[in-house]
Interface confidence: low
């Protein structure tokens, strides 16, 4: 029988009455157009909803938008369109919500053709009040908040000017012209690329990378011949054109661009690309596209300086620049990532790593599933996960994989069981141990979300017909109850719950259609009465993450340490609560060769933990570029994995000597850099 339909499933007592008392309908007085929803702040209960409706007239498009505000997690909404003077808001800029709990909101308005500049509406009190501000420029991008100070905003204009505000959008100053891309760094630093001749497109590969640390008072050119740049963790990356041909290479800086090193990565040609898949303060996952229109490339993982890279995964699916990749960080368990590879026969297969890219394996076949038509051997196959690529290909996959840092070990995803991803209708699978084991959770495609730090999982069937039923589980997807939240089915458009998965409220969005009109409607369900009591100590159990062999003393050791978590028992029906903090107990492991990556000039043969010298470098001095100087490396082939905390045990020797010579291959040497002040 399907999960949730057997006798073992204990039913939640009187749940229909409890949920009926906590189901709140709101019908929006709108013609159906588009709707966007934003949460303002954390645990504030404030939601802003913007509805827009376009009427295409013969000579122009007439637009109308309405703004609604809720301060009770979506149970009730108030029309606050008059606070923005009934102005039509541009949906392509969305609602720019300030970082943390600043309570700041910026809405960008549509203005008539001949106006001198754009118009914004600003709120700094969680959208209770708005101030209208006319801009001295037409914005090209959404206002970007400095992560360190929400009063500092930057925006690019349609004429490629870089504009900065120091007083939350009240006053604006153009600090530079001819800007292609701008990003906030740390400490209110702004990085941006500029063009000298024609345009961003024409100068691609001849751009300059600039930095200002004082909001435009002074500038420093930190790179030339730039194609593009990116920030990840504590790393600043730039792809730089080679002197002699059309190839480009990645350079990396860990000091905001003062000094650069060339990353030991392959160079790429005009049609190829680099992509930072994930980065933290320890390391980076970098995708390097394969030559030709193959749709795949190679994942490399960096050392702690972002310079030396180890090949992590071949034939990694990534369709085109800015295209689709299935690379997913499983945030519910440290070190776990899932992605897809394109195999030789053109089929797509899912791979998982539990040690931050050290080794990749197939996902274990769920015990309650059979291998499908893609499997050569009906008894041996794997789970394959549908993610961004499947969604882009219009497969019947309504949602990407889901995991939450505070719902430890839980991963939910659509998938199929075979030798490759199948085009057939997928089912929903769940893992409760960070991807080591999987179970079929629901038949067919569903929308799903996690509430109360994993205490409740909610799902709605993906259907082209109107729906009025929601499913929920209080035991991590083993057993399911169904609740009819309305008598009149609605055309479902989305599930919304507060980011962070701490809430116990879920909003079901959709529209009703009658003979002449259609209207937006939301149903917000509060599950607080289903989880009647607060969880106590007895409701939690100790769980060792990454445990595969309890007999082994090193069981659970990943990146040099193991972690024990307190996790809610599946049988406990209680509230983790909004203030729930994940309780974990780390313990350090002894070092083994698994705790080291292969150093520059070395590689790991398949299924071997030893690093061996690359044949082409045997007997050569190992010299490489570091901070614009040439370094000589004395090594026996190992370098500690970034973030690895192991102690004792195996301890390979390495030493780096400064050769006191300049690198000729480094295009970003400090001599080429200059400073200027406004």
């Amino acid at each position: 029988s399907a999960p949730g339909e057997d006798e073992e499933c204990g039913r939640v007592r009187d749940f229909v009455a409890k949920l009926a008392n906590n189901t709140h309908q709101h019908v929006f007085d709108d013609l159906r157009g588009s709707v966007s929803l934003s949460w303002v702040g954390d645990s504030t209960g404030v939601i802003l909803v913007l509805t827009t409706f376009h009427v295409p007239l013969v000579i122009m498009t007439f637009g109308q938008s309405k703004l609604y505000r809720s301060e009770d997690y979506g149970k009730n909404f108030k029309d606050i369109t008059d606070l923005i003077n009934n102005t039509f808001i541009r949906t392509e800029f969305g609602m720019a919500i300030g970082p943390e709990n600043s309570g700041k909101v910026v809405l960008t308005a549509e203005v008539s053709g001949g106006s001198r500049g754009g118009r914004i509406f600003r709120s700094s009190d969680f959208a209770k009040n708005f101030v209208q501000t006319d801009l001295p420029f037409h914005p090209l991008t959404q206002m970007m908040y400095s992560p360190q100070n929400s009063d500092y905003l930057l925006a690019l204009s349609t004429e490629n000017g870089l504009w900065v505000s120091k007083n939350f959008g009240g006053k604006w100053e153009e600090i530079h012209k001819a800007v292609c891309l701008a990003k906030w760094g740390s400490d209110n630093t702004i990085f941006f690329t500029t063009y000298a001749n024609g345009s961003c497109k024409a100068d691609l590969g001849a751009l300059e990378l600039w930095r200002t640390s004082d909001l435009g008072k002074s500038f420093k050119t930190i790179g030339v011949k730039i194609y593009s740049f990116g920030l990840g963790g504590r790393f600043l990356f730039a792809s730089v054109m080679a002197d002699k041909d059309t190839t480009r290479r990645i350079h990396v800086s860990t000091d905001q661009g003062d000094t650069w090193s060339m990353a030991q990565l392959p160079s790429v040609g005009q049609e190829q690309f680099y992509s930072i898949l994930a980065a933290n303060d320890d390391m980076v996952f970098m995708h390097v596209d394969e030559p030709g229109d193959t749709g795949f490339g190679t994942i490399f993982t960096s050392d702690d300086r972002g310079i030396v890279y180890s090949k992590s995964l071949d034939r990694h699916l990534y369709t085109t620049t800015g295209g689709e990749t299935d690379f997913t960080n499983v945030t519910s368990l440290r070190g776990v990532y899932i992605t897809s590879v394109l195999s030789e026969d053109n089929s797509i297969q899912t791979m998982i790593t539990f040690d931050q890219g050290g080794r990749w394996t197939h996902l274990r076949k769920p015990e309650n599933s059979e291998c499908d038509a893609t499997a050569k051997n009906k008894n041996e196959c794997s789970l394959h996960i549908h993610a961004s690529y499947s969604i882009s290909q219009k497969l019947n996959v309504p949602m990407a994989p889901l995991s939450e840092p505070n719902a430890v070990g839980i991963v939910i995803a659509h998938g199929s069981v075979g030798d490759a991803i199948s085009v057939m209708v997928p089912d929903v699978y769940i893992s409760d141990d960070g991807g080591y084991s999987w179970t079929k959770m629901l038949e067919g495609p569903h929308y799903y979300t996690i509430l109360d730090s994993g205490g409740i999982i909610v799902a709605i069937e993906h259907s082209s017909r109107p729906i009025n039923v929601i499913k929920f589980s209080t035991d991590e997807g083993q057993c399911w109850q169904t609740y009819t939240f309305t008598r009149d089915p609605i055309y479902f458009t989305g599930l919304a719950s507060e980011p962070g998965a701490r809430s116990m409220n879920i909003s079901i969005w959709g529209f009703t259609e009658s003979f002449l009109t259609s209207q937006w409607v939301s149903y917000t369900i509060d599950f607080k009465d289903i989880l009647e009591r607060n969880c106590e100590e007895k409701d939690y159990t100790i769980w060792l993450a990454h445990s595969t062999d309890p007999e082994d003393y090193e069981d659970g050791c990943i990146l040099g340490y193991k972690e024990q978590f307190l996790r809610l028992r599946k049988s406990s029906v209680c509230q983790n609560g909004r203030d729930y903090v994940v309780t974990k107990q780390p313990s350090i492991c002894l070092c083994s060769l698994e705790d080291f990556l292969c150093d520059f000039g070395y590689y790991r043969p398949e299924n071997d933990s030893k690093c061996v010298e690359q044949p082409e470098l045997k007997g050569h001095d190992l010299e490489f570029c570091l901070y614009g100087r040439e370094e000589h490396l004395t090594t026996n082939g190992y370098r500690k994995i970034p973030g690895d905390k192991c102690q004792g045990g195996v301890n390979p020797v390495r030493e780096v000597k400064d050769l006191k010579k300049k690198c000729t291959s480094n295009f970003l040497s400090p001599e080429k850099q200059n400073s200027k002040s406004n």
């Epitope: 394109l342 026969d345 053109n346 089929s347 797509i348 038509a373 893609t374 499997a375 050569k376 690529y389 290909q393 219009k394 497969l395 019947n396 075979g418 030798d419 490759a420 991803i421 199948s422 085009v423 057939m424 209708v425 082209s464």
Partner: antibody, heavy 125, light 108 residues
Framework: QVQLVQSGAEVKKPGASVKVSCKAS????????ISWVRQAPGQGLEWMGS????????NYAQKLQGRVTMTTDTSTSTAYMELRSLRSDDTAVYYC??????????????????WGQGTTVTVSS | EIVLTQSPGTLSLSPGERATLSCRAS???????LAWYQQKPGQAPRLLIY???SRATGIPDRFSGSGSGTDFTLTISRLEPEDFAVYYC?????????FGGGTKVEIK
Amino acid sequence: QVQLVQSGAEVKKPGASVKVSCKASGYTFTSYGISWVRQAPGQGLEWMGSISAYNGNTNYAQKLQGRVTMTTDTSTSTAYMELRSLRSDDTAVYYCARDPSGGTTLHYYYGMDVWGQGTTVTVSS
Amino acid sequence: EIVLTQSPGTLSLSPGERATLSCRASQSVRSSYLAWYQQKPGQAPRLLIYGASSRATGIPDRFSGSGSGTDFTLTISRLEPEDFAVYYCDQLGSSPRTFGGGTKVEIK
């Protein structure tokens, strides 16, 4: 050149079985699947199922499940379709077609690009 | 299952005219999984278009395919005498594979 050659016409009584063959030539048989499609007189096309010549995996239409069996013989590059418990509404022309998606999953569908000439099966008492 | 509805059922046109055939799906179909076939009386179907818009080997460029989601179109820019036949669309976007009911293009 690439071609699929099917066995000759058959006349069967209701309740009997029929087995149609489809011999492939001009390409690597195991690199593709074979799909079977039928067409009742004056009607449209109806997909019956697919088989992977690579691993023998099958995928049948729901309405024929239990009555149809598809097999391949890689030594002779031949695909077979057997239909049991024949009824009068099984009277149709039966086609085999080369199908890149048959039984295995590509991330792109290239269509059924080569077809057999068709086998007429008449079911009559 | 996904139902493919082809329209019109019959299209009466003269040689040299443009033919536009429609195939509508009951739910969204991945465009890379839609194909068009031509069938003449007494013959097996012939693949014309795969991936909604890619011409199969040997198919003249007067045949073109377009569309995405639930609406797909086969266009024959200038009808030649040999183009009068029945045309079927076919989807493999979700199981089971289904064909449309067909559009007959006949000489006016």
